[in-house]
């Protein structure tokens, strides 16, 4: 007799999950060296028992905490670099300016990073088939209740000035429903973050803009203002040349405005 | 049908090596992880460590650290176990045990056991 | 390292007893945790994982349950071919753990 099986409205866990957060877990110990340390096994044991088992709506930040034990890193608190909608143009930068790190820098970031994982409740079986989508099913499920958690501890972790990219394409340049929006403004410690830097990346071409002044950065700017943290914005006209720059500082033509 | 299947039984001498082999057949060798697991004469089972041959990483009880190595040959489809600086409370018959990568269930494949005695 | 006790070490029963084994973990294990038989110079068997599922091929006489700290393993009508040691194993985190064993004879 076939088990009923809930249908969520997600994709189902990426295949090859464990497997893969293992060999992630191998490489990134591997190239870090203050990592090595780690045990990989362990460290997917503490996973696992985070969300198999358990309903996949029911998940919580507790259920998290023996993962982010064996996960604890130090990461230079000045050099954070957070993003909102631009993931691919941040990861870019962090490969080239190695010295700045982004959530998915972190070994708990890596691990993660663009995955879907969910179990079944009173089961020891990963669900394959679908998991819960934040907006259709539930917000308390494993991959959403993970990077709220890790998001914040690294929100929490950071000092001095803390840098964040924004997607100047986007409706909302500043969206407070984001997991920047949401988890990391609000989790910034005012006794130890001096200045948050918004980089408004341009998409177009042609585009001379100061999206520094769209209400949405705005409104960015008054919610940290009121948690006593001054904020500063930048444009960026042209990410390619930004990047280019990023690599080669001598080049003559990186003293113009990027 | 799964088989491990491990080499026979040793004789040592205190301060030696040992080196356990458990070869697996009937399976998809990389798809499973292999422990190693001890058993002094009227004794309970003890576990020792476990080796991802997909991975080729091990670990292990902290109790053996230093004196045990875990590895597997993917080419021979075969998990080992080496123990050094052998005393005479490391005679025990050793077994190896099948699980799977993710850990999500039990040993369920057992080779038959290696006696290994230490004794001078 | 967490700890597993079973409960008892040892037990006399006769042929369609109910036997009852209980084992306890040091800290929550959730439901990661299998029983082992054992008979003499023989190699374990898997009976039951994730506390209450029954391994592939075993009889339904063996049943299992509990979760967090604690786990019974239940003969629900010993046999002649049930009498051997059985072990508790926790596979929550590493180290791997057994309980001491329950040695199940004949009455």
């Known amino acids: 007799v076939p088990r009923w099986r809930q249908q969520w409205s997600g994709p189902g866990t990426t295949k090859r999950f464990p497997e893969t957060v293992l060999a992630r877990c191998v490489k990134y110990t591997e190239i870090h060296p203050e990592m090595r340390h780690v045990d990989c096994q362990s460290v997917w044991d503490a996973f696992k028992g985070a969300f198999i088992s358990k309903h996949p709506c029911n998940i919580t930040e507790e259920d998290y905490q023996p993962l982010m034990k064996l996960g604890t890193q130090t990461v230079p608190c000045n050099k954070i670099l957070l993003w909102s909608r631009i993931k691919d143009l941040a990861h870019q930068f962090t490969q080239v300016q190695r010295d700045m790190f982004t959530l998915e820098d972190t070994l708990l970031g890596y691990l993660a990073d663009d995955l879907t994982w969910c179990g079944e409740f009173n089961t020891s079986k990963i669900n394959y088939q679908s998991c819960p989508d934040w907006r259709k099913d539930c917000s308390n499920n494993p991959v959403s209740v993970f990077w709220k958690t890790v998001s914040r501890r690294f929100a929490e972790a950071a000092c001095d000035v803390v840098h964040v990219m924004l997607n100047g394409s986007r409706s909302k340049i500043f969206d407070k429903n984001s997991t920047f929006g949401s988890v990391e403004v609000h989790n910034l410690q005012p006794e130890k973050v001096q200045t948050l830097e918004a980089w408004v990346i341009h998409g177009g071409r042609e585009d001379s803009r100061d999206l520094c002044q769209d209400p949405t950065i705005k409104e960015l700017e008054s919610i940290i203002s009121k948690r006593n943290i001054q904020f500063s914005c930048k444009n960026i006209y042209r990410p390619d040349k930004f990047l280019q720059c990023v690599k080669n500082p001598e080049d003559s033509s990186c003293t113009s405005e990027i | 049908q799964v088989q491990l299947v491990q080499s026979g039984a040793e004789v040592k001498k205190p301060g030696s090596s040992v080196k356990v082999s458990c070869k697996a057949s009937g399976g998809t060798f990389s798809s499973y992880a292999f422990s190693w697991v001890r058993q002094a004469p009227g004794q309970g089972l003890e576990w020792m460590g476990r080796?991802?041959?997909?991975?080729?990483?091990?670990n292990s009880a902290q109790k053996f650290q230093g004196r045990v190595t875990i590895t597997a040959d993917k080419s021979t489809s075969t998990a080992y176990m080496d123990l050094s600086s052998l005393r005479s409370e490391d005679t025990a018959v050793y077994y190896c045990a099948r699980d799977d990568i993710a850990a999500l269930g039990p040993f369920d494949y057992w080779g038959q056991g290696t006696l290994v005695t230490v004794s001078s | 390292d967490i700890q597993m006790t079973q409960s008892p070490s040892s037990l006399s029963a006769s042929v369609g007893d109910r036997v009852t084994i209980t084992c306890r973990a040091s800290q929550g294990i959730s439901s990661w945790l299998a029983w082992y038989q054992q008979k003499p110079e023989k190699a374990p068997k898997s009976l039951i994982y994730?506390?209450?599922s029954l391994q592939s091929g075993v009889p339904s006489r063996f049943s299992g349950s509990g979760s967090g700290t604690d786990f019974t393993l239940t003969i629900s009508s010993l046999q002649p071919e049930d009498f051997a040691t059985y072990y508790c194993q926790q596979y929550n985190s590493y180290p791997r753990t057994f309980g001491q064993g329950t040695k199940v004879e004949i009455k």
């Open positions: 994730a506390a209450s």
């Open positions: 080796v991802i041959p997909h991975l080729g990483i091990a």
